[in-house]
């Protein structure tokens, strides 16, 4: 269990002449919203698709009205975070999305108007725990700065927030190698913080800074095993009975990393994720200033030069971690379109492209529109190895070489009036006649037989769908 | 595709109530907006109440303020007007209708509503 947040820090113009001086149209003042979906994975969602793993609402922002002469202010936005509980495991990969709505606060025809000023989408990696991620985002003429971090709650720790802390009332009954089957009692409440490196499985702390073992092991950091054994000469051979789990030796049981350095484990091995400070295959080496070039993979290293003070490595593309020590799996994003193969040559992504599809993502099909043009201001639309011409109004044809007239073809029923719209045609149905072609009567009654489409305007009011 | 059905039409007497319900399925996430509307014989369609599903705001018509009522269920994936003290000039066809939003959705403008039930009954007589 944990809560992920999201801080907006501004949301305003983007740079570049195109850009709006104000989020309010020129009806009058407006209030912005901002609302947060999170999808698991980093595949590419449906933007209609659930926000599995939750959603969250700002709170509304304060009224904006712009002032003509004024030079555009910063806009007044919703106080506080924005904050998605989640109930199970954090999934690590997940996709973001930002939605910025615009309320109009003045009286107007048709009622207040709502409008989605902008929507960014990010897919992204973040471990549980870390550090506050900073991220700026431009969608359309708008520009969106945000942090967001995700946190374990209750008593969850971890990466995923899957392990589950210790009672303060510790020691537990359980042996060694074995902990107390969720869920904890009501009793247990988050435990302080212990001496770095103390193992989160073995060992626990009444005050902050000490490491105090479980039965059943021992050691400064409670990493090693001791003989002894609570869970064994109860009732029943299983383990079961006794209220007690045996997790199977794992590469990051016991936590091999030190000076708080957190495990995750890789097949067959472990990987040790160091703070700033630290280095080495199990966060074992310190008091690192940027003079013992700690830096791996040509990044750049940046602090004093005295034993105090820390380093931070800027990393080039391709490469993460403290110590620039983690290659990004940049393929993971799936950057190649139409099913080309990703190849990360460390310099550089390449895609292999299947046959037929050409470009450095793979999103030009060959096959279709090269050398192929559609007359009289038609595009020409890809897909399926054949192209298409989607035409301007009022052409049509394979090539939109030949004149069309939506209305030739007198497809408004029961005396319909006609109109070419530019985007197909529109039918201004005859009184007693409604439907998207007046095909249905109205009866006396005020009662019609009409499909799941809406009804037919009155004369003189053209529908806006098709 | 979103689809819309009305139920909970009828005759009523005038200074009566009833509760019109609307279940919609499909792509319901999209539905950022859902309303009912009214068109009466020879009338055009009107925006009686619309919600905005995910922040709880709600639009009246000046016609029935203080006497309608909309809210929703989002388990359910329904929306509910509650009529009282019903009108005759209230008899007319109710339609319950969706929209998502890229531009400009303004809450009683049946023009910018994209998905439409078949419509409900309602007649009050004096």
């Known amino acids: 269990a944990g809560v992920f947040e999201l801080q907006i820090h501004s949301f305003g113009p983007g740079p570049g002449p195109g850009a709006p001086r104000s989020p309010c149209s020129a009806r009058g003042p407006c209030r912005l919203f901002f609302r947060v979906c999170l999808k698991p994975g980093l595949s590419e969602e449906a933007a209609e698709s659930p926000c599995a793993l939750g959603a969250a609402l700002s709170a509304r922002g304060p009224v904006y009205t712009e002032q003509p002469e004024a030079p555009a202010p910063d806009l007044p936005l919703p106080n506080g975070l924005l904050q998605v509980p989640f109930r199970d495991a954090w999934p690590g990969t997940f996709s973001l999305i930002i939605e910025t709505w615009r309320e109009e606060l003045g009286d107007q025809i048709g009622g207040p108007a709502w409008s989605l000023l902008a929507r960014v989408t990010r897919r992204r990696r973040l471990a549980a725990g870390g550090p506050w991620a900073r991220d700026i985002q431009r969608a359309g003429a708008w520009e969106l700065r945000f942090s967001y971090r995700a946190r374990c709650e209750l008593l969850a720790v971890g990466t995923a927030c899957t392990r589950l802390c210790r009672p303060r009332s510790a020691p537990s009954r359980c042996g060694p190698g074995l902990r107390p089957c969720a869920p904890l009692e009501d009793e247990c409440e988050a435990p302080p913080v212990c001496r770095a490196g103390c193992s989160l499985e073995h060992g626990f702390c009444e005050q902050p800074g000490e490491c105090r073992c479980l039965e059943g092991w021992t050691g400064p950091l409670c990493t090693v095993p001791a003989s002894t054994s609570s869970c064994l000469g109860l009732r029943g051979p299983s383990s079961a009975t006794t209220g007690c789990l045996v997790p199977g030796p794992g590469p990051c049981d016991g936590n091999p990393c030190a000076n708080g350095g957190s495990c995750s484990e890789t097949p067959g091995s472990f990987e040790c994720t160091c703070p700033r400070g630290f280095y080495g295959l199990r966060c074992e080496v310190s008091g690192v200033t940027c003079a013992d070039g700690p830096c791996f993979n040509g990044g750049l290293c940046v602090g004093g030069a005295d034993p105090d003070s820390a380093y931070i490595c800027h990393c080039p593309p391709g490469f993460q971690g403290s110590n620039c020590e983690k290659r990004v799996d940049r393929c993971s994003l799936q950057p190649c379109r139409n099913g080309g193969l990703c190849l990360d040559l460390g310099h550089a992504l390449r895609c292999r492209c299947r046959a037929g599809f050409a470009g450095p993502r793979c999103e030009h099909n060959l096959d279709d529109c090269a050398g192929r043009a559609c007359a009289n201001g038609g595009t020409c639309v890809e897909g399926g190895g054949a192209h298409r011409c989607s035409c301007a109004l009022g052409f049509g044809g394979r090539d939109c070489r030949e004149r069309a007239d939506p209305c030739a073809a007198r497809p408004c029923a029961h005396g319909g009036r006609c109109y070419a719209h530019f985007s197909g045609l529109v039918c201004a149905c005859a009184p007693g006649y409604m439907g998207s072609r007046c095909e249905f009567p109205v009866h006396p009654d005020g009662v019609s037989a009409l499909p799941a489409a809406p009804p037919g305007l009155r004369p003189g009011d053209p529908q806006r769908y098709l | 595709q979103v689809r819309l059905v009305e139920s909970g039409g009828g005759s009523v007497q005038a200074g009566g109530s009833l509760r019109l319900s609307c279940a919609a399925s499909g792509s319901t996430y999209s539905t950022n907006f859902m309303g009912w509307f009214r068109q009466a014989p020879g009338k055009e369609r009107e925006g009686v109440a619309t919600?905005?599903?995910?922040?709880?705001?709600?639009a009246y018509a000046d016609s029935v303020k203080g006497r309608f009522t909309i809210s929703q269920d989002r388990a359910k994936n329904t929306v509910y007007l509650q009529m009282n003290s019903l009108k005759p000039e209230d008899t007319a066809m109710y339609y319950c209708?969706?929209?998502?939003?890229?531009?400009?959705?303004?809450?009683?403008?049946?023009?910018?509503?994209?998905?439409w039930g078949q419509g409900t009954q309602v007649t009050v007589s004096s």
């Open positions: 919600l905005v599903t995910w922040v709880e705001r709600t």
């Open positions: 209708a969706a929209a998502a939003a890229s531009t400009d959705v303004r809450l009683l403008d049946p023009g910018d509503f994209a998905y």
